[in-house]
């Protein structure tokens, strides 16, 4: 039962991580600039994301502009975009693999194969968690580097945006969720196939209960 609980918690955390990653990638709040113009006394915030940048006036009015040409974009931004999309797709792949191995599905009937699929999905989620970290940490590093660079003008300096914090949260959730799924399988693995039959008995329509198997097979 502990294994089942770990799996449920793992997949819930993973789903939350995926949603966070999606919002993080979509929001134009990776880099945030707060400044008061030298000549015009109008406070404004500039939000920069992977897909667009927005200018928010003190009046609350917001104007967003989608980046025109992909080729004209800086290489780090192109890489961050690519990693974001790849990560989101990898998580979806992981979810499909998990569903194939989940206790409540009949895609795969062999209990060992099912447990292996859950383990694979966990590994996929851990990898996606690491991939999520890359563009987020990369961007944060460039923001911090600019902040301490004396030749970068104040107007060009940025602050860490909400998307970066969401990205870190997403990465943490994916790593934790994936880790729990891996743990669920490894903890099950120590108890041998008997444990997996208990776990997966609901997914195999005509399987016998554990007590009906001769114990000599599990020595």
């Amino acid at each position: 039962m502990a294994s089942t609980g770990l799996q449920i918690l793992g997949i819930v955390l993973t789903l939350l991580g995926w949603v966070n990653a999606l919002v993080s990638c979509a929001l134009p709040m990776w880099k945030v600039t707060a400044f008061i113009g030298n000549s015009i006394v109008v406070a404004q915030m500039v939000w920069e994301g992977l897909w667009m940048s927005c200018v928010v006036q003190s009046t609350g009015q917001m104007q967003c502009k989608v980046y025109d040409s992909l080729l004209a974009l800086p290489q780090d931004l192109q890489a961050a975009r690519a990693l974001c999309v790849v990560t989101l797709l990898i998580v979806l792949l992981g979810l499909l693999v998990y569903l194939a191995g989940a206790k409540c599905t009949t895609c795969v009937e062999d209990r060992n194969s099912k447990s292996r699929l859950v383990l694979i999905s966990g590994i996929i989620f851990v990898i996606s968690g690491v991939l999520t970290l890359i563009p987020v940490c990369w961007t944060a590093h460039s923001i911090i580097q600019d902040f301490y660079n004396p030749l970068v003008a104040d107007a060009q300096k940025r602050e860490l945006g909400a998307s970066l914090y969401l990205g870190w949260a997403a990465s943490g959730l994916l790593l934790l969720g994936g880790g729990l799924l891996c743990c669920a399988c490894s903890s099950g693995g120590t108890q041998g196939p008997r444990h997996y039959m208990a776990c997966y008995s609901t997914s195999v329509p005509h399987s016998r209960g554990p007590s009906e198997y001769p114990t000599k097979n599990y020595v």
């Epitope: 800086p74 660079n149 030749l151 970068v152 003008a153 107007a155």
Partner: antibody
């Protein structure tokens, strides 16, 4: 109008010392990063040192570290460069530079003061 | 240290022509590059920063571009007042270094 006037240059023997000054006017001195950049007789530009607006952070290349010291007096709107253990390769025109709020890099340059290190 | 290799060392062109000065960084500097113009007997002046952004008051015939670690300063429709030395400079990390300069003359 931004005005930067350097002074203190001259002829000095190798191993000697010299103190350059830069009088700033036309802007709020304590709001800007300041730097010194030199231009050798061969017309090469070399970054010498940078100091933060408050004076708390200084940045030097290895070539002058330990020999040159930058400082600023925000009350007097003056930037200083204390140069010691001077070498012949330090012979150059020294420019005082102000950073900018909008532009990266060395935005406003003074007219320069010539330092000649020779026997 | 990051080395900035600027070319050509000197350049002669006619009024109205388009000229391009290039600068290559020895390693990645992102877009942390500035271009300066120094007229005879004067102090250098900032023209371009962040590799492509023009300083206010600089004529639009000047433009900066980047391709990886190679940067270019292009002057369209060359004017007689553009006769000067041009320098590139990176500010990616300490120490900040300049290119060796390009002397631009009018034929």
């Amino acid at each position: 109008e931004v005005k930067l006037v350097e002074s203190g240059g001259g002829l000095v023997k190798p191993g000697g010392s010299l103190k350059l000054s830069c009088a700033a006017s036309g802007f709020t001195f304590n709001s800007y990063t300041m730097s010194w950049v030199r231009q050798t007789p061969a017309k090469r530009l070399e970054w010498v040192v940078t100091i933060s607006s408050g004076g708390g952070r200084t940045y030097y290349p290895d070539s002058v570290k330990g020999r040159f010291t930058i400082s600023r007096d925000n009350a007097r709107n003056t930037l200083y460069l204390q140069m010691s253990s001077l070498r012949s390769e330090d012979t150059a025109m020294y420019y005082c530079i102000r950073g900018d709020y909008r532009y990266d890099g060395f935005a406003y340059w003074g007219q320069g003061t010539l330092v000649t290190v020779s026997t | 240290d990051i080395q900035m290799t600027q070319s050509p060392a000197s350049l002669s062109a006619s009024v109205g022509e388009t000229v391009t000065i290039t600068c290559r960084a020895s390693e990645n500097i992102d877009s942390y590059l500035a271009w300066y113009q120094q007229k005879q007997g004067k102090s250098p002046q900032l023209l371009v920063y962040a590799s492509t952004l023009l300083v206010d008051g600089v004529p639009s015939r000047f433009s900066g571009s980047r391709s990886g670690t190679q940067f270019s300063l292009k002057i369209n429709s060359l004017q007689s007042e553009d006769v000067a030395r041009y320098y590139c400079q990176h500010y990616y990390s300490i120490p900040y270094t300049f290119g060796s300069g390009t002397k631009l003359e009018i034929k």
